[in-house]
Interface confidence: medium
């Protein structure tokens, strides 16, 4: 049914879905705090622009009786139930913030006639790509794939002189929501990553992974996995690893590698860590003081979602344009706005762009060092350390196939 939007006459409301099933196990109170901090900033910005309007948020809570797994497995129906709740109450804001689970976002997008923008902190899966009114404020799987293909093909750097065309992917089904969809994208036979690689095999058992580490008949020297160093240690332990194995550890939402007192454990020496360039520490943040790095990113995405709405509202009001139109719903893309701790760029499809950082462990200092950065917006790699102190022979990344000469 057609739901009237509380979105005119100088009063603009944001509907925030507070779902029990979430991409990250974050107390809803922290997300509320992030939203409220965002609202304060938006009100200030609108006032500074001479726009005397009211902006509020309505938090829509799930009853939690049926959908109580806490993770994303039972989120599909929860999202639709919340939309039904909004519909029954005849109370929809100008914009919908949430959900974060790929399943629920996909289903909500599919099952509703969306004439309003949807902003998500999550929805990492490929099934949420290219959605006309969906904006994603945490790096989706597509961005990861494009980095990996770009890096695999690179062969003109002092530390990487071989193109790669093969990989193992370790995926055992216990991953966090972000990792699940990142690895799912790499596994999918029709994905860009699979299309560009000549050989790719998914390892699903711990033993399969462990055997590959010293298997002379392995088909690739490169293994991609997703999680933190502790996750890798649980799996790998102190097992011997062949000298030309390269493990790519995808750990995007983790700032710990950049902390001063962090020393890389010995088991990380064969590992390249892919993470995101951390947030701007120059701005003290009241909402994130007590959050872990991952949770900070999640709460920050909620806050930035509010700031994005404020940015678009300001533009439309200054131009005298109507907010409850398809034009507004489709406008949340191909732009840069003032985020909480710096500029946030959205691509043509409303997905956040970011700087990814590839780290290695220095054999000299046992510290994580930056090997290269990658700008997802321009699909471009910037080499940083031209003489890395690698564990690999000649301080160069090995070929992906043992015994194959230069190409």
């Amino acid at each position: 049914s057609q739901v009237s939007q509380n979105c005119h006459n100088g009063s603009y409301e944001i509907s925030v879905l507070m779902m029990g099933n979430s991409a990250f196990a974050e107390p809803l109170k922290n997300l509320e705090d992030a939203v409220n901090e965002g609202l304060e900033i938006v009100r200030g910005r609108l006032q500074n622009a001479g726009l005397n309007v009211t902006v509020n948020a309505t938090f829509m809570y799930s009853d939690g009786l049926i959908h109580n797994s806490g993770d994303c497995r039972s989120s599909t129906c929860e999202g639709l139930d919340l939309l039904r709740k909004i519909s029954n109450a005849q109370r929809m804001g100008c914009v919908l913030i949430g959900p974060s689970c790929t399943y629920s976002t996909f289903q909500m997008y599919l099952d509703t006639e969306l004439s309003y923008p949807m902003i998500s902190a999550g929805s990492f899966g490929l099934s949420c790509d290219y959605k006309e009114t969906l904006t994603r404020l945490m790096s989706p799987a597509r961005k990861l794939m494009y980095f990996l293909v770009n890096f695999w093909k690179t062969n003109d750097l002092p530390f990487k002189t071989y193109s790669w065309s093969t990989s193992y992917v370790y995926k055992n089904g216990t991953e966090t929501e972000d990792c699940f969809w990142y690895l799912n994208a790499l596994e999918a036979s029709v994905s860009y990553f699979s299309h560009e690689l000549g050989f790719k095999v998914v390892l699903r058992q711990d033993k399969e992974f462990q055997d590959i580490l010293m298997d002379h008949n392995r088909k690739s020297n490169v293994i991609i996995m997703c999680g933190g160093p502790e996750f890798l240690y649980k799996l790998k332990g102190d097992r011997a690893v062949a000298e030309d194995i390269v493990i790519i550890l995808v750990d995007l939402f983790n700032d710990q590698y950049f902390e001063d007192n962090v020393t890389a454990p010995d088991y990380m020496k064969n590992v390249l860590v892919l993470t995101l360039s951390p947030g701007n520490s120059l701005l003290n943040s009241s909402f994130s003081r007590n959050l872990s790095p991952t949770k900070r990113d999640f709460a920050l995405a909620y806050l930035n979602g509010i700031l994005l709405f404020g940015h678009m509202l300001k533009i439309f009001l200054e131009n005298g344009e109507n907010i409850t139109t398809p034009k507004f719903a489709h406008a949340f893309r191909n732009l840069t706005f003032e985020g909480y701790d710096g500029p946030v760029t959205l691509d043509d499809w409303g997905d956040v762009d970011s700087t990814m950082v590839l780290l290695y462990t220095s054999v000299d200092t046992k510290k994580y060092k930056v090997l290269l950065t990658y700008d997802t917006h321009v699909n471009k790699t910037y080499p940083v350390d031209m003489s890395p102190t690698f564990t690999w022979k000649n301080s160069k990344l090995p070929n992906d196939i043992t015994g194959r000469g230069p190409q």
């Epitope: 902390e259 060092k369 700008d375 321009v378 910037y382 350390d385």
Partner: nanobody, 115 residues
Amino acid sequence: AVQLVESGGGMVQPGGSLRLSCAASGFTFGAYDMTWVRQAPGKGAEWVSAINSGGDRTYYTDSVKGRFTISRDNAKNTLYLQMNSLKPADTAKYYCGTKIPQFLRGQGTQVTVSS
């Protein structure tokens, strides 16, 4: 040791120009996106401008667009902020910084715009 040292601030009349510099040492400067942040007396810090690690993408807060230009020279480990058409509202202490938590900002350089 990691260091960021800002310079180039001063007192200038409205409509005047200044060029701020930020010399970085002790870390791989070319690896990181860099930002300029400012703080006016009694106010919170606000970011002014940012530039990506390669130097080919720049951003500005609305109030300085068209007046300020951020740039970097990775060979010299230096970040710049060219400020034109300065206004009294630009009066603040300006800090450069990376987006990496362990690299604390420098001492800052004071910019005062007054007639």
